[in-house]
Protein backbone atom coordinates (compact mmCIF):
# COMPACT_ATOMS: atom_id res chain seq x y z
CA UNK A 1 0.00 0.00 0.00
CA UNK A 2 1.18 3.51 -0.68
CA UNK A 3 2.76 5.24 2.29
CA UNK A 4 1.30 8.70 2.82
CA UNK A 5 -1.51 11.16 2.57
CA UNK A 6 -2.30 14.83 2.48
CA UNK A 7 -5.35 15.50 4.64
CA UNK A 8 -7.36 18.70 4.42
CA UNK A 9 -5.35 20.04 1.52
CA UNK A 10 -6.23 20.91 -2.04
CA UNK A 11 -5.07 20.09 -5.54
CA UNK A 12 -1.75 21.74 -6.30
CA UNK A 13 -1.27 24.04 -9.25
CA UNK A 14 -0.06 21.76 -12.04
CA UNK A 15 3.74 21.61 -12.34
CA UNK A 16 4.23 24.52 -9.91
CA UNK A 17 6.42 22.24 -7.80
CA UNK A 18 8.92 21.01 -10.39
CA UNK A 19 11.03 19.37 -7.69
CA UNK A 20 8.24 16.96 -6.73
CA UNK A 21 8.88 13.26 -7.29
CA UNK A 22 6.79 10.13 -6.98
CA UNK A 23 8.83 7.18 -5.77
CA UNK A 24 7.18 4.15 -7.34
CA UNK A 25 7.26 0.44 -6.64
CA UNK A 26 6.27 -1.86 -9.49
CA UNK A 27 4.59 1.03 -11.28
CA UNK A 28 2.51 2.32 -8.37
CA UNK A 29 3.04 5.39 -6.21
CA UNK A 30 4.74 4.47 -2.95
CA UNK A 31 6.22 7.63 -1.49
CA UNK A 32 6.98 11.23 -2.19
CA UNK A 33 10.43 12.50 -3.02
CA UNK A 34 12.20 15.69 -3.91
CA UNK A 35 14.71 16.37 -6.66
CA UNK A 36 17.77 17.88 -4.97
CA UNK A 37 20.26 17.53 -7.83
CA UNK A 38 20.08 16.62 -11.51
CA UNK A 39 20.56 12.94 -10.80
CA UNK A 40 19.44 12.64 -7.18
CA UNK A 41 16.09 12.41 -5.39
CA UNK A 42 15.78 12.67 -1.63
CA UNK A 43 13.11 10.58 0.09
CA UNK A 44 12.55 8.62 3.32
CA UNK A 45 14.50 5.47 4.19
CA UNK A 46 11.46 3.57 5.49
CA UNK A 47 9.85 3.82 2.06
CA UNK A 48 12.00 1.02 0.71
CA UNK A 49 11.70 -1.28 3.71
CA UNK A 50 9.24 -3.60 1.96
CA UNK A 51 10.58 -3.08 -1.54
CA UNK A 52 13.31 -5.73 -1.53
CA UNK A 53 12.11 -7.67 -4.58
CA UNK A 54 10.25 -4.91 -6.41
CA UNK A 55 11.28 -2.49 -9.12
CA UNK A 56 11.83 0.99 -7.74
CA UNK A 57 11.49 3.93 -10.14
CA UNK A 58 11.11 7.69 -9.84
CA UNK A 59 8.49 9.73 -11.67
CA UNK A 60 9.41 13.36 -12.36
CA UNK A 61 7.51 16.18 -14.06
CA UNK A 62 4.13 14.79 -13.06
CA UNK A 63 0.93 16.34 -11.83
CA UNK A 64 -1.42 13.47 -12.64
CA UNK A 65 -0.16 9.98 -11.90
CA UNK A 66 -2.28 8.40 -14.63
CA UNK A 67 -2.73 10.96 -17.41
CA UNK A 68 -0.14 11.54 -20.12
CA UNK A 69 1.76 14.81 -19.64
CA UNK A 70 4.57 16.09 -21.87
CA UNK A 71 6.88 16.72 -18.93
CA UNK A 72 6.39 13.34 -17.25
CA UNK A 73 9.22 10.85 -17.27
CA UNK A 74 9.87 7.67 -15.31
CA UNK A 75 13.49 7.04 -14.31
CA UNK A 76 15.08 3.83 -13.19
CA UNK A 77 17.12 3.92 -10.00
CA UNK A 78 20.83 3.26 -10.32
CA UNK A 79 21.53 3.31 -6.60
CA UNK A 80 19.51 3.62 -3.40
CA UNK A 81 21.39 5.02 -0.41
CA UNK A 82 19.52 4.97 2.88
CA UNK A 83 21.07 6.90 5.76
CA UNK A 84 23.44 4.44 7.49
CA UNK A 85 21.83 5.01 10.89
CA UNK A 86 18.21 4.59 9.82
CA UNK A 87 16.45 1.65 11.49
CA UNK A 88 13.05 0.05 10.92
CA UNK A 89 11.78 0.75 14.44
CA UNK A 90 12.69 4.44 14.83
CA UNK A 91 11.88 7.70 13.07
CA UNK A 92 15.45 8.92 13.40
CA UNK A 93 17.65 9.42 10.31
CA UNK A 94 14.75 8.58 8.01
CA UNK A 95 16.42 9.71 4.80
CA UNK A 96 17.08 8.02 1.48
CA UNK A 97 18.96 9.24 -1.56
CA UNK A 98 18.05 7.74 -4.92
CA UNK A 99 20.47 8.08 -7.81
CA UNK A 100 18.63 8.15 -11.11
CA UNK A 101 19.85 6.02 -14.01
CA UNK A 102 20.71 9.26 -15.81
CA UNK A 103 20.56 12.99 -15.22
CA UNK A 104 17.02 14.30 -15.28
CA UNK A 105 15.97 16.35 -18.25
CA UNK A 106 15.39 19.73 -16.67
CA UNK A 107 12.73 22.21 -17.71
CA UNK A 108 9.87 24.29 -16.29
CA UNK A 109 8.27 21.17 -14.81
CA UNK A 110 11.46 19.44 -13.62
CA UNK A 111 13.89 21.40 -11.50
CA UNK A 112 15.93 20.65 -8.34
CA UNK A 113 14.92 22.46 -5.15
CA UNK A 114 17.52 24.32 -3.06
CA UNK A 115 17.82 22.71 0.36
CA UNK A 116 18.65 24.27 3.69
CA UNK A 117 22.27 23.99 4.78
CA UNK A 118 22.19 26.33 7.77
CA UNK A 119 21.48 24.17 10.80
CA UNK A 120 18.98 26.43 12.54
CA UNK A 121 15.37 25.72 13.50
CA UNK A 122 12.57 27.19 11.40
CA UNK A 123 10.68 29.68 13.57
CA UNK A 124 7.48 28.30 15.12
CA UNK A 125 4.42 29.56 13.25
CA UNK A 126 6.21 29.72 9.89
CA UNK A 127 3.88 28.47 7.16
CA UNK A 128 5.43 25.68 5.12
CA UNK A 129 4.16 23.78 2.12
CA UNK A 130 3.93 20.01 1.98
CA UNK A 131 2.79 18.13 -1.11
CA UNK A 132 2.11 14.55 -2.09
CA UNK A 133 -0.06 11.94 -3.74
CA UNK A 134 -1.07 10.24 -0.51
CA UNK A 135 -4.68 9.50 0.39
CA UNK A 136 -6.86 12.52 0.95
CA UNK A 137 -9.35 11.28 3.55
CA UNK A 138 -9.71 8.70 6.30
CA UNK A 139 -11.69 6.49 3.93
CA UNK A 140 -8.48 6.01 1.98
CA UNK A 141 -9.28 7.77 -1.29
CA UNK A 142 -6.11 8.14 -3.33
CA UNK A 143 -5.78 11.23 -5.49
CA UNK A 144 -4.58 11.06 -9.04
CA UNK A 145 -3.26 14.61 -9.00
CA UNK A 146 -0.74 16.19 -6.66
CA UNK A 147 -2.19 17.65 -3.46
CA UNK A 148 -0.67 20.19 -1.11
CA UNK A 149 -1.32 21.91 2.19
CA UNK A 150 0.18 24.82 4.14
CA UNK A 151 1.12 23.93 7.71
CA UNK A 152 2.50 26.07 10.54
CA UNK A 153 5.74 24.87 12.13
CA UNK A 154 5.27 23.78 15.75
CA UNK A 155 7.88 24.42 18.43
CA UNK A 156 9.80 21.31 19.51
CA UNK A 157 8.89 21.63 23.19
CA UNK A 158 5.19 21.34 22.40
CA UNK A 159 5.86 18.46 20.01
CA UNK A 160 7.81 16.69 22.77
CA UNK A 161 4.95 16.85 25.30
CA UNK A 162 3.79 13.49 26.64
CA UNK A 163 0.43 13.80 24.86
CA UNK A 164 2.16 14.64 21.59
CA UNK A 165 5.37 12.75 20.77
CA UNK A 166 6.67 12.38 24.33
CA UNK A 167 10.31 13.30 23.93
CA UNK A 168 10.89 11.57 20.58
CA UNK A 169 11.60 14.77 18.65
CA UNK A 170 15.35 15.23 18.54
CA UNK A 171 17.18 18.30 17.27
CA UNK A 172 17.37 16.57 13.88
CA UNK A 173 13.57 16.50 13.56
CA UNK A 174 10.92 19.20 13.32
CA UNK A 175 7.15 19.25 13.65
CA UNK A 176 4.25 20.92 11.93
CA UNK A 177 0.70 21.30 13.16
CA UNK A 178 -1.76 18.55 12.32
CA UNK A 179 -5.19 19.94 13.17
CA UNK A 180 -7.28 18.32 10.40
CA UNK A 181 -4.73 19.49 7.83
CA UNK A 182 -1.80 17.12 7.80
CA UNK A 183 0.68 15.00 5.96
CA UNK A 184 0.88 11.34 6.84
CA UNK A 185 2.57 8.03 6.13
CA UNK A 186 2.67 7.89 2.38
CA UNK A 187 3.49 11.46 1.72
CA UNK A 188 6.56 10.07 3.40
CA UNK A 189 9.69 11.19 1.66
CA UNK A 190 7.98 14.28 0.32
CA UNK A 191 9.20 17.83 0.86
CA UNK A 192 8.36 20.37 3.55
CA UNK A 193 9.18 23.68 1.87
CA UNK A 194 9.50 26.93 3.80
CA UNK A 195 10.20 30.16 1.94
CA UNK A 196 11.08 28.30 -1.25
CA UNK A 197 13.73 26.17 0.46
CA UNK A 198 13.57 22.49 1.39
CA UNK A 199 13.61 22.32 5.19
CA UNK A 200 12.15 18.92 5.95
CA UNK A 201 11.31 15.49 4.60
CA UNK A 202 8.11 13.77 5.72
CA UNK A 203 9.00 10.86 8.01
CA UNK A 204 7.40 7.52 7.31
CA UNK A 205 6.66 6.17 10.77
CA UNK A 206 3.07 5.11 11.42
CA UNK A 207 1.13 7.95 12.97
CA UNK A 208 -2.47 9.05 13.47
CA UNK A 209 -3.24 11.70 10.87
CA UNK A 210 -5.13 14.94 11.32
CA UNK A 211 -5.11 14.79 15.13
CA UNK A 212 -3.72 18.02 16.57
CA UNK A 213 -2.12 16.12 19.45
CA UNK A 214 -0.02 14.06 17.04
CA UNK A 215 1.84 16.62 14.93
CA UNK A 216 3.51 15.75 11.66
CA UNK A 217 7.18 14.84 12.00
CA UNK A 218 9.77 15.93 9.44
CA UNK A 219 13.48 15.17 9.13
CA UNK A 220 15.48 18.40 9.08
CA UNK A 221 17.68 18.29 5.99
CA UNK A 222 20.10 20.92 7.33
CA UNK A 223 21.03 18.50 10.07
CA UNK A 224 22.15 16.01 7.42
CA UNK A 225 24.00 18.38 5.09
CA UNK A 226 27.32 16.59 5.51
CA UNK A 227 25.80 13.20 4.70
CA UNK A 228 23.86 14.51 1.69
CA UNK A 229 26.97 16.22 0.33
CA UNK A 230 29.08 13.10 0.82
CA UNK A 231 26.63 10.93 -1.13
CA UNK A 232 26.12 13.45 -3.92
CA UNK A 233 29.86 14.07 -4.30
Amino acid sequence: PPRGRILGGREAEAHARPYMASVQLNGAHLCGGVLVAEQWVLSAAHCLEDAADGKVQVLLGAHSLSQPEPSKRLYDVLRAVPHPDSQPDTIDHDLLLLQLSEKATLGPAVRPLPWQRVDRDVAPGTLCDVAGWGIVNHAGRRPDSLQHVLLPVLDRATCNRRTHHDGAITERLMCAESNRRDSCKGDSGGPLVCGGVLEGVVTSGSRVCGNRKKPGIYTRVASYAAWIDSVLA
Partner: antibody, heavy 116, light 112 residues
Framework: EVQLQQSGPELVKPGASVKISCKAS????????KNWMRQRHGESLEWIGD????????NYNQKFKGKATLTVDKSSSTAYMELRSLTSEDSAVYFC?????????WGHGTLVTVSA | DVLMTQTPLSLPVSLGDQASISCRSS???????????LEWYLQKPGQSPNLLIY???NRFSGVPDRFSGSGSGTDFTLKISRVEAEDLGVYYC?????????FGGGTKLEIK
Amino acid sequence: EVQLQQSGPELVKPGASVKISCKASGYTFTDYYKNWMRQRHGESLEWIGDINPNNGDANYNQKFKGKATLTVDKSSSTAYMELRSLTSEDSAVYFCAREGPSFAYWGHGTLVTVSA
Amino acid sequence: DVLMTQTPLSLPVSLGDQASISCRSSQTIVHSNGDTYLEWYLQKPGQSPNLLIYKVSNRFSGVPDRFSGSGSGTDFTLKISRVEAEDLGVYYCFQGSHVPPTFGGGTKLEIK
Protein backbone atom coordinates in the same frame (compact mmCIF):
# COMPACT_ATOMS: atom_id res chain seq x y z
CA GLU B 1 23.84 13.68 30.70
CA VAL B 2 20.55 15.44 31.43
CA GLN B 3 20.66 17.35 34.72
CA LEU B 4 18.26 19.69 36.50
CA GLN B 5 20.05 21.58 39.24
CA GLN B 6 17.71 23.22 41.75
CA SER B 7 18.53 26.08 44.12
CA GLY B 8 19.17 25.46 47.81
CA PRO B 9 16.78 25.33 50.78
CA GLU B 10 14.86 28.45 51.76
CA LEU B 11 13.64 29.58 55.18
CA VAL B 12 11.09 32.36 54.72
CA LYS B 13 8.65 34.27 56.86
CA PRO B 14 4.87 34.07 56.50
CA GLY B 15 3.55 36.56 53.94
CA ALA B 16 6.88 36.75 52.13
CA SER B 17 7.76 35.53 48.62
CA VAL B 18 10.45 33.16 47.41
CA LYS B 19 11.88 32.43 43.96
CA ILE B 20 13.45 29.06 43.34
CA SER B 21 15.41 28.03 40.27
CA CYS B 22 16.00 24.96 38.13
CA LYS B 23 19.03 25.08 35.82
CA ALA B 24 19.05 22.62 32.93
CA SER B 25 22.11 21.07 31.31
CA GLY B 26 22.87 18.16 29.00
CA TYR B 27 20.16 19.03 26.47
CA THR B 28 18.70 21.95 24.53
CA PHE B 29 16.67 23.87 27.08
CA THR B 30 14.02 25.09 24.64
CA ASP B 31 13.17 21.59 23.38
CA TYR B 32 11.14 20.48 26.41
CA TYR B 33 8.48 21.87 28.74
CA LYS B 34 9.42 22.31 32.36
CA ASN B 35 6.94 21.18 35.04
CA TRP B 36 6.82 21.96 38.75
CA MET B 37 5.51 19.74 41.56
CA ARG B 38 4.97 20.20 45.28
CA GLN B 39 5.43 17.54 47.94
CA ARG B 40 4.54 18.28 51.51
CA HIS B 41 6.28 16.22 54.17
CA GLY B 42 5.03 12.63 54.14
CA GLU B 43 2.50 13.36 51.42
CA SER B 44 2.04 12.71 47.72
CA LEU B 45 2.99 14.96 44.82
CA GLU B 46 0.88 17.79 43.40
CA TRP B 47 1.32 19.28 39.95
CA ILE B 48 1.68 23.07 40.12
CA GLY B 49 2.06 23.95 36.46
CA ASP B 50 4.24 23.86 33.38
CA ILE B 51 5.97 26.30 31.07
CA ASN B 52 7.04 26.36 27.44
CA PRO B 53 10.65 27.62 27.47
CA ASN B 54 10.36 28.98 23.92
CA ASN B 55 7.80 31.65 24.66
CA GLY B 56 7.18 31.57 28.40
CA ASP B 57 3.58 30.39 28.03
CA ALA B 58 2.60 28.80 31.33
CA ASN B 59 -0.29 26.59 32.42
CA TYR B 60 -1.30 26.37 36.07
CA ASN B 61 -3.22 24.02 38.28
CA GLN B 62 -6.23 26.11 39.36
CA LYS B 63 -5.24 25.41 42.95
CA PHE B 64 -1.94 27.29 42.51
CA LYS B 65 -3.13 30.25 40.43
CA GLY B 66 -2.15 33.40 42.26
CA LYS B 67 0.29 31.42 44.40
CA ALA B 68 2.88 30.37 41.81
CA THR B 69 4.39 32.21 38.85
CA LEU B 70 6.54 30.31 36.37
CA THR B 71 9.18 32.00 34.22
CA VAL B 72 12.24 31.03 32.19
CA ASP B 73 15.54 32.60 31.23
CA LYS B 74 16.65 31.05 27.96
CA SER B 75 20.10 32.65 28.12
CA SER B 76 20.96 30.72 31.27
CA SER B 77 18.78 27.63 30.54
CA THR B 78 17.00 28.21 33.83
CA ALA B 79 13.37 27.88 34.87
CA TYR B 80 12.06 29.77 37.89
CA MET B 81 9.07 29.47 40.17
CA GLU B 82 8.06 32.34 42.43
CA LEU B 83 5.74 31.58 45.35
CA ARG B 84 4.04 34.49 47.07
CA SER B 85 2.00 35.22 50.20
CA LEU B 86 3.57 32.19 51.83
CA THR B 87 1.94 30.42 54.76
CA SER B 88 2.92 27.35 56.74
CA GLU B 89 0.78 25.34 54.28
CA ASP B 90 3.33 26.13 51.59
CA SER B 91 6.17 24.44 53.49
CA ALA B 92 7.20 21.60 51.18
CA VAL B 93 9.79 20.25 48.80
CA TYR B 94 9.34 21.69 45.31
CA PHE B 95 10.54 19.71 42.30
CA CYS B 96 11.10 20.71 38.69
CA ALA B 97 10.87 18.02 36.03
CA ARG B 98 11.43 17.90 32.29
CA GLU B 99 8.49 16.68 30.25
CA GLY B 100 9.54 14.27 27.55
CA PRO B 101 9.72 11.39 27.79
CA SER B 102 7.07 11.59 30.55
CA PHE B 103 8.74 12.98 33.71
CA ALA B 104 11.94 11.03 33.16
CA TYR B 105 14.20 13.76 34.53
CA TRP B 106 13.72 15.54 37.87
CA GLY B 107 15.60 18.07 39.92
CA HIS B 108 16.68 16.98 43.41
CA GLY B 109 14.07 19.26 44.97
CA THR B 110 14.14 22.53 46.92
CA LEU B 111 12.93 22.55 50.51
CA VAL B 112 10.94 25.67 51.37
CA THR B 113 10.19 26.19 55.06
CA VAL B 114 7.75 28.91 56.06
CA SER B 115 8.20 29.89 59.69
CA ALA B 116 8.01 33.00 61.81
CA ASP C 1 -9.72 16.92 38.89
CA VAL C 2 -9.12 13.22 38.30
CA LEU C 3 -8.68 11.45 41.63
CA MET C 4 -6.12 8.64 41.60
CA THR C 5 -6.68 6.12 44.40
CA GLN C 6 -3.92 3.66 45.23
CA THR C 7 -4.22 0.50 47.28
CA PRO C 8 -2.79 -0.66 49.53
CA LEU C 9 -1.34 2.29 51.43
CA SER C 10 1.45 0.08 52.76
CA LEU C 11 2.70 -3.19 51.32
CA PRO C 12 4.97 -5.33 53.52
CA VAL C 13 6.82 -7.95 51.45
CA SER C 14 9.65 -10.42 51.80
CA LEU C 15 12.54 -10.13 49.38
CA GLY C 16 11.90 -12.38 46.36
CA ASP C 17 8.12 -12.13 46.73
CA GLN C 18 5.78 -10.74 44.10
CA ALA C 19 4.20 -7.38 44.87
CA SER C 20 1.10 -5.88 43.29
CA ILE C 21 -0.12 -2.29 43.59
CA SER C 22 -3.51 -1.11 42.36
CA CYS C 23 -4.43 2.34 41.05
CA ARG C 24 -7.96 3.43 40.22
CA SER C 25 -8.91 6.71 38.52
CA SER C 26 -12.18 8.53 39.20
CA GLN C 27 -12.84 8.74 35.46
CA THR C 28 -11.41 7.18 32.34
CA ILE C 29 -7.93 8.41 31.53
CA VAL C 30 -7.98 7.63 27.83
CA HIS C 31 -6.81 10.83 26.16
CA SER C 32 -8.65 12.35 23.20
CA ASN C 33 -5.76 11.16 21.01
CA GLY C 34 -6.51 7.54 21.97
CA ASP C 35 -3.53 6.97 24.27
CA THR C 36 -3.69 6.37 28.01
CA TYR C 37 -1.15 8.41 29.93
CA LEU C 38 -0.83 6.34 33.06
CA GLU C 39 2.64 6.29 34.59
CA TRP C 40 4.31 4.75 37.64
CA TYR C 41 7.08 6.38 39.67
CA LEU C 42 9.24 5.11 42.52
CA GLN C 43 10.48 7.57 45.13
CA LYS C 44 13.18 6.41 47.48
CA PRO C 45 13.70 8.24 50.79
CA GLY C 46 15.28 11.67 50.31
CA GLN C 47 15.29 11.37 46.50
CA SER C 48 13.21 12.64 43.62
CA PRO C 49 10.81 10.23 41.87
CA ASN C 50 12.06 7.87 39.16
CA LEU C 51 9.99 6.97 36.10
CA LEU C 52 9.31 3.24 35.86
CA ILE C 53 6.38 2.78 33.49
CA TYR C 54 4.72 5.06 30.94
CA LYS C 55 1.56 4.67 28.88
CA VAL C 56 0.27 1.89 31.17
CA SER C 57 2.71 -0.86 30.28
CA ASN C 58 5.89 0.52 28.70
CA ARG C 59 9.06 0.18 30.79
CA PHE C 60 11.31 3.23 30.73
CA SER C 61 14.88 2.55 29.59
CA GLY C 62 17.01 0.87 32.25
CA VAL C 63 14.01 -0.33 34.30
CA PRO C 64 14.36 -4.06 35.10
CA ASP C 65 11.86 -6.41 33.48
CA ARG C 66 10.61 -7.56 36.88
CA PHE C 67 8.46 -4.40 36.75
CA SER C 68 5.32 -4.63 34.64
CA GLY C 69 2.26 -2.44 34.23
CA SER C 70 -1.20 -3.35 33.03
CA GLY C 71 -4.79 -2.11 32.99
CA SER C 72 -7.17 0.06 31.00
CA GLY C 73 -9.90 2.63 31.41
CA THR C 74 -9.91 3.32 35.15
CA ASP C 75 -8.13 0.30 36.67
CA PHE C 76 -4.38 -0.17 36.58
CA THR C 77 -1.82 -2.41 38.25
CA LEU C 78 1.92 -2.36 38.82
CA LYS C 79 3.52 -5.75 39.48
CA ILE C 80 7.02 -6.49 40.73
CA SER C 81 7.74 -10.15 40.07
CA ARG C 82 10.59 -10.64 42.55
CA VAL C 83 11.12 -7.81 45.00
CA GLU C 84 14.72 -6.76 45.60
CA ALA C 85 16.05 -4.49 48.35
CA GLU C 86 16.55 -1.63 45.89
CA ASP C 87 12.82 -1.67 45.07
CA LEU C 88 11.80 -0.39 48.48
CA GLY C 89 10.25 3.07 48.62
CA VAL C 90 6.99 4.80 47.78
CA TYR C 91 5.27 4.03 44.47
CA TYR C 92 3.04 6.62 42.84
CA CYS C 93 0.69 6.24 39.91
CA PHE C 94 0.13 9.33 37.78
CA GLN C 95 -2.30 10.36 35.06
CA GLY C 96 -1.28 12.87 32.39
CA SER C 97 -4.34 12.58 30.17
CA HIS C 98 -6.39 15.32 31.83
CA VAL C 99 -5.50 18.77 33.18
CA PRO C 100 -4.43 19.07 35.88
CA PRO C 101 -2.26 15.96 35.88
CA THR C 102 -2.63 14.10 39.17
CA PHE C 103 -0.71 11.62 41.30
CA GLY C 104 -2.03 8.81 43.44
CA GLY C 105 -1.56 8.94 47.21
CA GLY C 106 1.35 6.51 47.12
CA THR C 107 2.02 2.95 48.24
CA LYS C 108 4.93 2.28 50.58
CA LEU C 109 6.73 -0.95 49.76
CA GLU C 110 8.56 -2.16 52.87
CA ILE C 111 10.18 -5.27 54.29
CA LYS C 112 7.88 -7.59 56.19
